[in-house]
């Protein structure tokens, strides 16, 4: 009769699993885009913002030719775990100004956690090692000011959007190579 409902499949089509990861990544990309736009409307950004604790971009036009599934999934998972930490930190330490975005930040965190679980499942199905982050985890202190938390939010959402954008492209490309 097959495995009981809700139990993980023992064997699975990696392309279908990757498809599912692409759909979740696209969905999170759309959510992040929407939230970043909301942030810009409520708190217009004066120029560009960056945070030293955010991961550096892993993909570009130059890396697409040499992409391999293990490396992409491992790096994506590590980077998204870092972004998850930053979103959690924003929700905890962002101050009153960011409380107006709390429902959206909460939903974004839940989606990010869901995507991370999906990537972990995909990696275990492909028998890839669940690598720990290479870079040391930088402790995130409280923002210097209310404006500091807003600048941090712009940087986090902008960086996450860019990471997810490349992730969709990379995963689509890898699907064709499976």
């Amino acid at each position: 009769p097959g495995p009981p409902a809700g139990s993980p499949r023992v064997s699975s089509d990696p392309r279908a699993d990757l498809d599912s990861a692409v759909l979740l990544t696209r969905s999170l990309l759309a959510d992040t885009r929407q939230l970043a736009a909301q942030m810009r409307d409520k708190f217009p950004a004066d120029g560009d913002h960056s945070l030293d604790s955010l991961p550096t971009l892993a993909m570009s036009a130059g890396t697409l030719g040499s992409l391999q599934l293990p490396g992409v999934l491992t790096r994506l998972r590590v980077d998204l775990m870092s972004y998850l930490r930053h979103v959690q930190w924003l929700r905890r330490a962002g101050g009153p100004s960011l409380k107006t975005l709390e429902p959206e930040l909460g939903a974004l965190q839940a989606r990010l956690e869901r995507l991370l679980r999906r990537l972990q499942l995909l990696m275990s199905r492909l028998a890839l090692p669940q690598a720990a982050p290479d870079q040391p985890v930088i402790p995130l202190g409280p923002p210097a000011s209310a404006w500091g938390s807003i600048r941090a939010a712009h940087a986090i959402l902008g960086g996450l959007h860019l990471t997810l954008d490349w992730a969709v492209r990379g995963l689509l490309l890898l699907k064709t190579r499976l």
């Epitope: 570009s60 960086g159 490349w166 969709v168």
Partner: antibody, heavy 117, light 110 residues
Framework: EVQLLESGGGLVQPGGSLRLSCAAS????????MNWLRQAPGKGLEWVGV????????FYADFVKGRFTISRDNSKNTLYLQMNSLRAEDTAVYYC??????????WGQGTLVTVSS | QSVLTQPPSASGTPGQRVTISCSGS????????VNWYQQLPGTAPKLLIY???LLPSGVPDRFSGSKSGTSASLAISGLRSEDEADYYC???????????FGGGTKLTVL
């Protein structure tokens, strides 16, 4: 607000050279791959090439290989297109555009290059 | 001759729904994301749809994209006079190792 501003276009003779610039503002320039595209008068869009965010990788359309070179200076937030051995068919409006993945999410207003004797 | 094929023109009356097609091959549309750009007369192109069906912020949801196999389409519902423009589809091409475009479709609002 993201802004891309091209400059350096003008009239040049066949076989001549020209260098276009694209000044970027309103975003972290060093995080984004950048492209040049072009549009001949009354014609469609054509991709010229892309340079990776750190500047070490470049890809070009076949029609410009060996004649055009894309470079960038991240300290100046500027993208360049060096065009050599220009031909009449290179006459077009040249656009710079930002790439966050597979698409061009912001474009400059364009600069016209006319190759004619 | 463009790598991606679009009808040169399309038209509709205000309020109508119009669809623009874009066909390619497995090396471009079949394996890669499709993007759509709108170019209003005398202006630079603007991103309209990315990753087949996602809308950038600021683009009204009257615009929608879809993809099936090696073809894609752009639909505009509730057509308005300000939608009169050229529309281009685009995708990465694995064989050419570069970005390819359709020839563009001139949309006229009657």
């Amino acid at each position: 607000e993201v802004q891309l501003l091209e400059s350096g276009g003008g009239l040049v003779q066949p076989g001549g050279s020209l260098r276009l610039s694209c000044a970027a503002s309103g975003f972290t320039f060093s995080h984004y791959d950048m492209n040049w595209l072009r549009q001949a008068p009354g014609k469609g869009l054509e991709w010229v090439g892309v340079i990776s965010y750190e500047g070490s990788n470049k890809f070009y359309a076949d029609f410009v290989k060996g004649r055009f070179t894309i470079s960038r200076d991240n300290s100046k937030n500027t993208l360049y297109l060096q065009m050599n051995s220009l031909r009449a068919e290179d006459t077009a409006v040249y656009y710079c555009a930002r790439t966050p993945g597979s698409h061009f999410d912001y474009w400059g207003q364009g600069t016209l290059v006319t190759v004619s004797s | 001759q463009s790598v991606l094929t679009q009808p040169p023109s399309a038209s509709g009356t205000p309020g109508q729904r119009v669809t623009i097609s874009c066909s390619g091959s497995s090396s471009n549309i079949g394996n890669n994301a499709v993007n759509w750009y709108q170019q209003l007369p005398g202006t630079a192109p603007k991103l309209l749809i990315y990753y087949d069906d996602l809308l950038p912020s600021g683009v009204p949801d009257r615009f929608s994209g879809s993809k099936s196999g090696t073809s894609a389409s752009l639909a505009i519902s509730g057509l308005r006079s300000e939608d009169e423009a050229d529309y281009y589809c685009s995708a990465w091409d694995d064989s050419l190792n570069g970005v390819v475009f359709g020839g563009g479709t001139k949309l006229t609002v009657l």
